[in-house]
């Protein structure tokens, strides 16, 4: 019996198609993905195949502005129209608390809303209950499939689920509940979620049952072959585990952004052991034409957004790249341009002795979602900063010891080069780093901007020395894994939306030009 | 391999009763929701009455309220309708459907998402 897998995962707010590097389309004859041509794909193979699953491994929360003015109810509905089998919620589900999951999305999804590892206790447990299930089993032709899902256990650092949700360990929650489905006889099941490749890789090791695994997360590409476009595989598709148990249990993730669709071809035998597996990933470039009907209610949904948003607030004569391939490993020039709007955001002429109360600045790079293309004749609105900030954040005052800074700067590169959100880029701070040593001693120069200067200048910082640092209120929570600023910080003064601060300053500007300039080296 | 049967359906005059069973093959009853849906000819198929396994909470849609009741009986692996003051417009065939998954009785009769097991179905007649 053979079973065709579509999949998705990370989508983040890309309901329209977008350029090859996933930010707002500007030349339409080489745009990609976008709701309208996934839905003309998958309808061709569902017409072409008889055995046919479509699911989400979550993260279609969050990333544009579709995302900021209809706070997912867009996904509900096109999600809807594509007519998903399943999806696995992903952390940025809960951006909106849980509240913003539960009216817009798990309440109008058509289709099962899944995580095996998340619990609800306290008074969510009756109010949430029965909306997002463990596993669902559904049919397909005459036979039946159990899918089960997961979630990222970091979501509490990552986003905004509240006390009354608690977050399991994967493994150790996904057991007990396959082993359910194969007291029920399911002989067929896939372990569909949101928690990384390499977490993906250990439940193919280590769940026993599980068949097939499909994840999300880590916005993995994988790909046999030559690669149809700039995304580089990071293995091949499908990715073979051998389990504890000796079993080859096929892996996939399909990127990002809706701009793959994942495709997964799986023999089973009579007692539902996977006999072969292939595939790729389908580029979802031009070649494939939108779907008209779609197109249209993407276009009437479209009317209410531009209201919004399309209103120039300056120019950039120089590339903005905010992509992670960029953010999460070295300075970028984007990650320069919001610490310098933090800090203008920040000016406040304090005394003769100071030139200003506050020259630091830290942002995780994991915060900046997208590039801004200069050849759009250098416009940047607010559209364009919503997918670069679609998290409607704040910029935060705080006030830190000088070890506790060093301590973030450690975490920052703990484990470089995994493309991981908590590389920091700077403002007011020069760093070096060897990645030749040891996690937890890597950072071998330090220096800060002084603000009790007239002519400000770079000196070393002193590890009891308290200063004032801008950073998202993300960090100052503790978010990805900077539980020492949480837990060390002196005083916390939350400040004005992410966004906004940024457009100001681009709108005072009017134009802007920021460079890669050494704040950050590697020595 | 696992089937649900449906039987009692039959010819019944409006003001009428008949019991309805499901009876189940290959599996325990016992962890599923169970339905029971009707399709009267050139209408969708609805959700009438739905049970859990767990809690054997139960869920009836508003035209069969006060009027039908569904039951389960475990140790024989079937699932009971009662219908009672039955109405020309109960005309209809009667499917049986199971679903292991934790749905709630309410989105299983909706239903709400794909059930993945089905009986063949009884007809339902209801004239004088």
């Known amino acids: 019996w053979e079973l065709t897998i579509l999949h998705t995962n990370d989508v983040h707010s890309r309901l329209e198609q977008t350029s090859e590097d996933s930010s707002k389309c500007v030349n339409a004859s080489r745009c990609m993905g976008g709701v309208a041509r996934l839905f003309t794909k998958v309808q061709q193979i569902r017409r072409a195949e008889p055995n046919v699953l479509l699911l989400d491994a979550g993260d279609q929360y969050q990333g544009t502005i579709w995302f900021t003015v209809y706070k997912g109810a867009e996904v509900a509905h096109f999600m809807n129209a594509l007519r998903y089998d399943a999806m696995a919620l992903g952390n940025h589900e809960f951006d909106n608390g849980v509240e913003g999951l539960i009216e817009p999305l798990l309440k109008e999804a058509k289709f099962p809303i899944l995580s095996a590892n998340i619990k609800a206790k306290g008074p969510l447990a009756s109010q949430i209950s029965g909306l997002y299930l463990p596993y669902k089993v559904l049919p397909v032709g005459d036979e039946v499939v159990g899918i089960v899902g997961y979630t990222s256990k970091e979501t509490p650092f990552l986003s905004n689920p509240g006390t009354n949700l608690v977050f399991e360990d994967e493994i150790t929650a996904l057991q007990p509940e396959v082993d359910k489905l194969k007291t029920l006889n399911v002989n067929k099941i896939i372990a569909l979620g949101h928690s990384g490749f390499e977490t993906d890789k250990l439940i193919a090791q280590k769940v026993r049952g599980v068949d097939v695994v499909v994840g999300g997360h880590s916005n993995t590409f994988l790909y046999t072959g030559n690669p149809p476009s700039k995304e580089v595989p990071a293995g091949k598709y499908p990715f073979i585990v051998t389990s504890d148990d000796g079993r080859k249990v096929p892996v996939v993730q399909a990127y990002a952004f809706g701009k793959y669709l994942g495709y997964l071809k799986i023999e089973f035998d009579e007692r539902g052991n996977v006999i072969s597996s292939h595939g790729n990933p389908i580029l979802l470039n031009s070649s494939i034409p939108e779907d008209p009907s779609i197109k249209a209610d993407i276009n009437k949904w479209r009317i209410k957004l531009d209201n919004y948003s399309t209103q120039e607030l300056g120019k950039t004569i120089v590339y903005l790249d905010g992509s992670s391939q960029s953010c999460r490993f070295r300075e970028c020039n984007m990650g320069n341009l919001i610490c310098d709007a933090m800090i203008n955001n920040n000016l406040r002429h304090a005394d003769e002795m100071f030139w200003n109360h506050v020259s630091m600045c830290i942002l995780n790079g994991g915060g900046i979602r997208s590039p801004i293309d200069e050849r759009n004749n250098g416009t940047i609105t607010w559209e364009n900063l919503a997918a670069v900030l679609p998290f409607g954040g704040t910029f935060d005052l705080v006030q830190l010891k000088g070890s506790t800074l060093k301590k973030a700067f450690e975490h920052s590169v703990h484990r470089y080069g995994q493309s991981t959100g908590e590389f920091l880029q700077v403002g007011g701070i020069h760093v070096v780093y060897d990645l030749s040593r040891k996690p937890g001693d890597r950072v071998v120069k330090l220096d800060v901007l002084c603000t009790k200067c007239r002519v400000p200048s770079y000196d070393p910082l002193k590890m009891d020395e308290i200063y004032k640092v801008i950073l998202p209120n993300f960090l100052a929570n503790g978010g990805d894994g900077f539980q020492m600023i949480k837990d060390e910080l002196l005083r916390h003064d939350s400040g004005d939306q992410d966004i906004n601060v940024v457009s100001t300053y681009i709108s005072k500007m009017k134009v802007i030009y920021p460079a890669v300039e050494g704040r950050i080296k590697f020595s | 391999q696992r089937q649900l049967v449906e039987s009692g359906g039959g010819l019944v005059q409006p003001g009428g009763s008949l019991r309805l069973s499901c009876a189940a093959s290959?599996?325990?009853?016992?962890?599923?929701?169970i339905g029971w849906f009707r399709q009267a000819p050139g209408k969708e198929r609805e959700g009438v009455s739905c049970i859990s396994g767990s809690d054997r909470s139960t869920y009836y849609a508003d035209s069969v309220k006060g009027r039908f009741t569904i039951s389960r009986d475990n140790a024989k692996n079937t699932v009971y309708l009662q219908m009672s003051s039955l109405r020309a417009e109960d005309t209809a065939v009667y499917y049986c459907?199971?679903?292991?998954?934790?749905?709630?009785?309410?989105?299983?009769?909706?239903?709400?998402?794909?059930?993945?097991?089905w009986g063949k179905g009884t007809l339902v007649t209801v004239s004088s």
């Open positions: 459907a199971a679903d292991p998954s934790p749905v709630t009785v309410q989105a299983m009769c909706l239903p709400r998402f794909p059930v993945p097991y």
């Open positions: 290959g599996f325990l009853l016992d962890y599923y929701v």
